[in-house]
């Protein structure tokens, strides 16, 4: 058998560090065996049999023209190996960083905090941790390890599914390359790390007969299992055409109607989500809808102009006790607390 | 010779922005997290964030979050910060660091002077 | 985060004193912490990493020790050219939180 170990990474290939000692061993002889070792393709000596190092080349603080195929001869000029010899640096600890766009599943994704130069893997698993004791504000490993599985075709991401929403667990992400392995634990609770993707199907439709309105509608995000008990809130922004600045509403349901827009210009709407009890963080913005205010047709019955209902619209309040947690339905209405007062008279 | 060195600060209103640069030379900086520290004059050291070699990872105080940004281009050897929203609180000499690996810095610039003021 | 304290704020020291200023870490931060110094008007400098190696080029009367909350930072023989001040740093966490800063300074 081979005196040398073999180093995790392709075979006949050696590891070092620049700046420092690297051994080399020549694989194919004995333990202690006296070798002659060569720069493959050129014929000069580097090290003669009576060394003294046996199977092993020292190379005193190894620089990047250290790097290359060396060969090994035996005393009666029998190849006793080639080795590569490839520098680079032990990991470091990856980076890593954690999400979940729904309260079941979450994915972390790592990158490597320096370039090690040399063939890297990593190894994801992950933790969950309880509290020891009722009174205690200590938390300590204590099922698992479990492995985070990675996703297929190399990206540097895993995913940890059927989550416990109110746990904490402890994910561990450990770079490996031939010089040693780096570890990085990272604590996760789910609701910290909570951001939903943005709602879906955003469509914004005038109103007929009230050019200043707009009826914006959207849906959960696919992603969002649809239980009761952990709903969205959303948060809207408008504004018009060639304006820089958005108005924002945080509507009740999956609908929300606009009451101040400016008649006869297009408005850019869109729509972010976030756990209705405030975990975790907003969604990014859905698309921006684009939708224009209709003309607007003049009741029938018009009022002399001194008789003009000029007050706010009030939508009728209903004294109904709230649910912790809404529907998952939308809350239908056309008048909402923030009409203003419309280009086109509305009837008292 | 290894070397950092920054650009871009100056005098700021309230509510401005900037952005700061940090050029690399005498290492290879594709190969290192990239750190923005910030000293207030006449006080501690604070860190403000980090960016891993192939850019893909970020990280912010607190204090900055949703303001700043950080970036980077590997075939420039360049380091930047985008300054979005500066407050007052912000006034002061910004360093670029360089790791190794993620929040040791064994390498500064000499630094940067932002000041916000109306 | 983490919070990292320093001891003393300040100190005045007599030239070949040995100098002592004490860190702690609000939670375990196993031996990921950092020494700088840093003379007046220029860029902080590392002097120990991961609680107890010197940095290349270093003085060796710089030294480190400590682990989990608790780590002390030693100048064995004060120098002149030791006048500054002395920053403890934390990097165990994705955000690195640095200490308020020990100066110091000759008698």
């Known amino acids: 058998s081979s005196p040398c170990p073999q180093a995790w990474g392709p075979p006949g290939v050696q590891y070092g560090q620049p700046g420092r000692s690297v051994k080399l061993c020549c694989p194919g002889v004995t333990a202690g065996d006296p070798v002659s070792w060569f720069r493959d393709g050129e014929p000069k000596l580097l090290q003669g049999p009576d060394s003294g190092l046996g199977h092993e080349l020292v190379l005193a603080q190894a620089d990047s023209t250290d790097e290359g195929t060396y060969i090994c001869q035996t005393l009666d000029g029998a190849l006793g190996g080639t080795v590569t010899l490839q520098l680079g640096y032990p990991p470091a600890r990856p980076v890593v960083s954690c999400q979940a766009a729904d309260y079941e599943n979450f994915s972390c994704t790592w990158s490597p905090s320096q370039i090690s130069g040399l063939p890297t893997r990593y190894l994801t698993s992950y933790r969950k941790k309880t509290v020891l004791g009722a009174d205690s504000q200590r938390r300590s490993p204590s099922t698992g390890p479990w492995p985070c599985p990675q996703d297929p075709l190399g990206a540097a991401r895993c995913v940890v599914h059927g989550a416990e929403f109110w746990s904490q667990y402890r994910i561990n992400v450990t770079e490996v390359n031939p010089l040693g392995a780096s570890t990085r634990l990272l604590d996760v609770s789910l609701q910290s790390i909570l951001r939903p993707d943005p709602p879906q199907g955003l469509r914004v439709e005038s109103v007929p007969g009230y050019p200043r309105r707009l009826r914006a509608s959207w849906t959960y995000p696919a992603s969002w299992p649809c239980q009761p008990h952990f709903l969205l809130k959303f948060r809207l922004q408008y504004r018009p055409a060639q304006h820089p600045a958005w108005s924002t509403v945080e509507p009740a349901g999956l609908e929300e109607v606009i009451t101040d827009a400016v008649a006869g210009l297009p408005h850019a709407v869109r729509v972010s989500a976030r756990d209705f009890l405030d975990a975790g963080t907003w969604s990014t913005w859905s698309p921006e809808a684009w939708g224009t205010p209709s003309t607007g047709t003049i009741p029938k019955e018009i009022p002399a102009w001194g008789q003009l209902h000029t007050q706010p619209e009030v939508e009728p309040q209903v004294d109904s006790p709230a649910p912790p947690r809404p529907s998952l339905q939308p809350h239908p209405r056309l008048l909402d607390h923030r009409d203003s007062v419309e280009q086109v008279a509305v009837l008292a | 010779e290894v070397q950092l060195l920054e650009s871009g600060g100056g005098l700021v209103q309230p509510g401005g922005s900037l952005r700061l640069s940090c050029a690399a030379s005498?290492?290879?900086?594709?190969?290192?997290?990239m750190t923005w520290v910030r000293q207030a004059p006449g006080k501690g050291l604070e860190w403000v964030s980090s960016?891993?070699?192939?850019?893909?990872?970020?990280q912010y105080a607190d204090s900055v979050k949703g303001r700043f940004t950080i970036s980077r281009d590997n075939s420039k050897n360049t380091l930047y910060l985008q300054m979005n929203s500066l407050r007052a609180e912000d006034t002061a000499v910004y360093y670029c660091a360089k790791g190794p690996g993620w929040g040791s810095f064994d390498l500064w610039g000499r630094g940067t002077l932002v000041t916000v003021s109306s | 985060d983490i919070q990292m304290t320093q001891s003393p704020s300040s100190l005045s020291a007599s030239v070949g004193d040995r100098v002592t200023i004490t860190c702690q870490a609000s939670?375990?931060?196993?031996?990921?912490l950092n020494w700088y110094q840093q003379k007046p008007g220029k860029a902080p400098k590392l002097l120990i990493y991961?609680?107890?190696n010197l940095q290349t080029g270093v003085p060796s009367r710089f030294s480190g020790s400590g682990s989990g909350t608790d780590f002390t930072f030693t100048i064995s023989s004060l120098q002149p050219e030791d006048i500054a001040t002395y920053y403890c740093?934390?990097?165990?966490?994705?955000?690195?939180?640095f200490g308020p800063g020990t100066k110091v300074d000759i008698k």
């Open positions: 991961d609680a107890s």
């Open positions: 005498g290492f290879t900086f594709s190969t290192y997290s």
């Open positions: 740093q934390q990097h165990e966490s994705q955000s690195p939180t």
């Open positions: 939670q375990d931060i196993n031996n990921y």
């Open positions: 960016i891993v070699p192939y850019g893909d990872l970020t």
